[in-house]
């Protein structure tokens, strides 16, 4: 079965810095979402080879991509405290396949020592069960936000 390898599991960065999240699959994708989980989970990007990526307005101008949809590195720049959270890759194949998640801890510089990543991958056990056409290696899924962002794209 198709899997999404996502790295890193966790990263601690100061305000204003950048972070790389890599989503890798064995291929055969139509595209890939990066979704931020939390009380109001939301799509951050949708990336499809040969198509202009869709980016949520909160991240416009501070996201870069390298690689292809099968092995995509997403760089988020100028991180803010509010960007702290768990980010999950959702690969679109004939089913939905999810990565294990990346916990991004954005800290004020003086408090960096207080917030450290553990080696364990992020878990999201309180989240709802995935759709039936989904494949999840971990209890990790994504729900939608009540008021969707004004991000609209059409290839």
């Amino acid at each position: 079965a198709q899997e999404v390898q996502q790295s890193p599991h966790c990263t601690t960065v100061p305000v204003g810095a950048s972070v790389n999240i890599t989503c890798s699959t064995s291929g055969g994708l139509r595209g890939i979402y990066l979704r931020q989980l939390g009380p109001q989970p939301q799509d951050i990007i949708y990336y499809e080879d040969g198509v202009v990526p869709t980016t949520d307005r909160r991240f416009r101008g501070r996201i870069d991509f390298s690689g292809s949809q099968d092995n995509l590195t997403i760089t988020m720049h100028r991180l803010q405290l509010s960007d702290t959270g768990t980010y999950t890759c959702q690969a679109i194949t004939e089913v939905n396949v999810y990565g294990s998640g990346t916990l991004v801890l954005v800290t004020e510089e003086q408090s960096q020592g207080w917030h450290r990543c553990s080696d364990a991958p992020p878990r999201a056990s309180a989240l709802p069960a995935p759709p039936t056409g989904s494949a999840l290696p971990d209890p990790q899924t994504a729900s939608a936000l009540p008021d969707p962002p004004a991000a609209s794209a059409l290839p």
């Epitope: 939301q42 799509d43 004939e94 290839p155």
Partner: antibody
Framework: EVQLVESGGGLVKPGGSLKLSCAAS????????MSWVRQTPEKRLEWVAS???????YYPDSVKGRFTISRDNARNILYLQMSSLRSEDTAMYYC???????????WGAGTTVTVSS | DIQMTQTTSSLSASLGDRVTISCSAS??????LNWYQQKPDGTVKLLIY???SLHSGVPSRFSGSGSGTDYSLTISNLEPEDIATYYC?????????FGGGIKLEIK
């Protein structure tokens, strides 16, 4: 059992507006993308709008800028706000659960929209 | 946009017949093709997804095949409840597009 029930259809004049609703039950609504599809009087099916589970919205050129899809996860309701309606928007409008970005596995019974002066 | 073509608009067959309905895409769609059944009362159901995967609860007499641009739906043993209109739909690329539909009637 998953159920989708559309409402809000009716007769509207060209240039007018209408808001359709789709009440969902029997599923974890917030976990799914959702779509609207319409069927013209000639029985052609046309995709109208989609919203991903994380809130991204997608439209064909024919309705972009006139229609807005949205969702209320607390109430398990999908919406389609339609404005600047034209006679060619006359159709039966169905909401559908979008299992995997375009794979529409459950459909409602539809609601009729007629645009006529 | 990808155009989906179902060459005939209606088809007549006898109960027990094997019926094949075709659909072609204006470009390759990598098997991202669904088949839907619409009953005379307007009810729409998914039959086949991703070219050949049978949706849950759909009788095994329905099957799908194809690749590239050419796809087909086969009903192996036509039953009275199969009287309906059948639509193909590609979901390889936005905008999602449907074929014009084939109305299946009993001889």
């Amino acid at each position: 059992e998953v159920q989708l029930v559309e409402s809000g259809g009716g007769l509207v004049k060209p240039g007018g507006s209408l808001k359709l609703s789709c009440a969902a039950s029997g599923l974890t609504f917030s976990s799914y993308a959702m779509s609207w599809v319409r069927q013209t009087p000639e029985k052609r099916l046309e995709w109208v709008a989609s919203i991903s589970s994380g809130g991204f919205t997608y439209y064909p050129d024919s309705v972009k800028g006139r229609f807005t899809i949205s969702r209320d996860n607390a109430r398990n309701i999908l919406y389609l706000q339609m404005s600047s309606l034209r006679s060619e928007d006359t159709a039966m409008y169905y909401c559908a659960r979008d299992e995997v970005r375009g794979y529409l596995d459950v459909w409602g019974a539809g609601t009729t929209v007629t645009v006529s002066s | 946009d990808i155009q989906m073509t179902q060459t005939t608009s209606s088809l007549s067959a006898s109960l027990g017949d094997r019926v094949t309905i075709s659909c072609s895409a204006s470009q390759g769609i990598s098997n991202y093709l669904n088949w839907y059944q619409q009953k005379p009362d307007g009810t729409v159901k998914l039959l086949i997804y991703y070219t050949s995967s049978l949706h849950s609860g759909v009788p095994s007499r329905f099957s799908g095949s194809g690749s590239g641009t050419d796809y087909s739906l086969t009903i192996s043993n036509l039953e009275p409840e199969d009287i309906a209109t059948y639509y193909c739909q590609q979901y390889s690329k936005l905008p999602y597009t449907f074929g014009g539909g084939i109305k299946l009637e009993i001889k």
